[in-house]
Amino acid sequence: IWSAVFLNSLFNQEVQIPLTESYCGPCPKNWICYKNNCYQFFNESKNWYESQASCMSQNASLLKVYSKEDQDLLKLVKSYHWMGLVHIPTNGSWQWEDGSILSPNLLTIIEMQKGDCALYASSFKGYIENCSIPNTYICMQRTV
Amino acid sequence: IWSAVFLNSLFNQEVQIPLTESYCGPCPKNWICYKNNCYQFFNESKNWYESQASCMSQNASLLKVYSKEDQDLLKLVKSYHWMGLVHIPTNGSWQWEDGSILSPNLLTIIEMQKGDCALYASSFKGYIENCSIPNTYICMQRTV
């Protein structure tokens, strides 16, 4: 492996080299670990309610988007997947499964259909969808 | 891979880790860890040579696709990114940075442009591209 010094001088790049390597997790086996959160993408299509139960059965929740910085891997996600965001008709707000309110400017909410559930799509977009429609889904487990 | 028990004693944490949960890595800080491989997606566009050097400077290589099963997270990647696959004009084969030959049926190679480098695109597709064209890139580090 060429030294970073030599490479930097060669290409005149200012590449910052991480000083440390670290372990990520713990996560369920074969889940994606990123910034100590665990993610899994499920291929089988389920409605929102079954997707929620499936995540719960794996000691997780449907995806919660809480930070563009900590979750920047989500920018590159292809397709549409159920996340844990639901519309509360009584007060018109969007909230996560834990009851916390969707922070402003985190997601661009797009009305694709009439519905009370939301699909995550790349670049931090949320598509409103009927909760009964089957879709793939993303489960997430936050490590302590 | 260090056992959860050892990690807990090392960091003096009193965390009970379910048997089905495990740590992933080690990886450079803030990289994605999946099935004990480390990945990072770089936003800045560089040509293939600069992308290769950037990965090397971080003790990594451009993405090597070696298993659809172990790297199934790549199915969901949006957009096009340089990977470590190059065309060898002398024998017409495609090979990785480490000199290994591209295994059959791993990638669908699509000729987008005349070129000797390849962009990774979702669902295990490889797009042939001129190595001098700037693109985003994926670095990968395999843990031992």
Partner: antibody, heavy 121, light 107 residues
């Protein structure tokens, strides 16, 4: 108005299998947002969740009972059932069936009247 | 599993008094906490869902609050018909668990 009614034997011998059925009336068992549950309450004690089922047949069980419990659904009969094998006196309880209306994290909004099952020889 | 604790175990209260029952979860459960009332020889009845959401048909004297690990059920002006056991229930993760209950008696 949805109503739930438990039925099954009130007395079961030790080591045998307890079988109960819950019949749903006044509503659909296949509504996409509904989950159906079994909960029990030993005499003079608190409530214990046994498990949930969705109309598709997906089940979710309490880990301490997992090896002994089976919950199934028969959508054509508007029924879901509980089977608990190898019972002991500790399984003596009032058994309730209940519903979550809007997904599995929702509260139990409708309960059956409960049926007392005694485990004794 | 998430362990739910309730206090007090027992409360003897005079009519029109305010009653406060607390429920604590062993880890954060967001607002996935529900309250039930159970009268002798009856099945439980839902009072409050998602920590603070009122239920149609439940008298307005019943209210709930809290988020995370600490929750409260308040009966604003106790009536004789409120003599019952009160249970909290977490639906945040499997297995679902209930608090041990608080018995409210009318003096």
């Amino acid at each position: 108005q949805v109503q739930l009614l438990e039925s099954g034997p009130g007395l079961v011998k030790p080591a045998e299998t307890l079988s109960l059925t819950c019949t749903v009336s006044g509503g659909s068992i296949t509504s996409t947002s509904y989950f159906w549950d079994w909960i029990r309450q030993p005499p003079g004690k608190g409530l214990e969740w046994i498990g949930s089922i969705y109309h598709s047949g997906s089940t979710y069980y309490d880990s301490s009972l997992k090896t002994r419990v089976t919950i199934s659904v028969d959508t054509s009969k508007y029924q879901f059932s509980l089977r608990l094998s190898s019972v002991t006196a500790a399984d003596t309880a009032v058994y309730y069936c209940a519903r979550h209306e809007f997904g599995i994290r929702d509260a139990f909004d409708i309960w059956g009247q409960g049926t007392l099952v005694t485990v004794s020889s | 599993e998430i362990v739910m604790t309730q206090s007090p175990d027992f409360q003897s209260v005079t009519p029109k008094e305010k009653v406060t029952i607390t429920c604590r979860a062993s880890q954060s459960i967001g607002n996935n906490l529900h309250w039930y009332q159970q009268k002798p020889d009856q099945s439980p009845k839902l009072l409050i869902k998602y920590a603070s959401q009122s239920i149609s048909g439940v008298p307005s004297r019943f209210s709930g609050s809290g988020f995370g690990t600490d929750f409260t059920l308040t009966i604003n002006s106790l009536e004789a018909e409120d003599a019952a056991a009160y249970y909290c229930h977490q639906s945040n993760s499997f297995p679902f668990t209930f608090g041990p209950g608080t018995k409210v008696e009318i003096k």
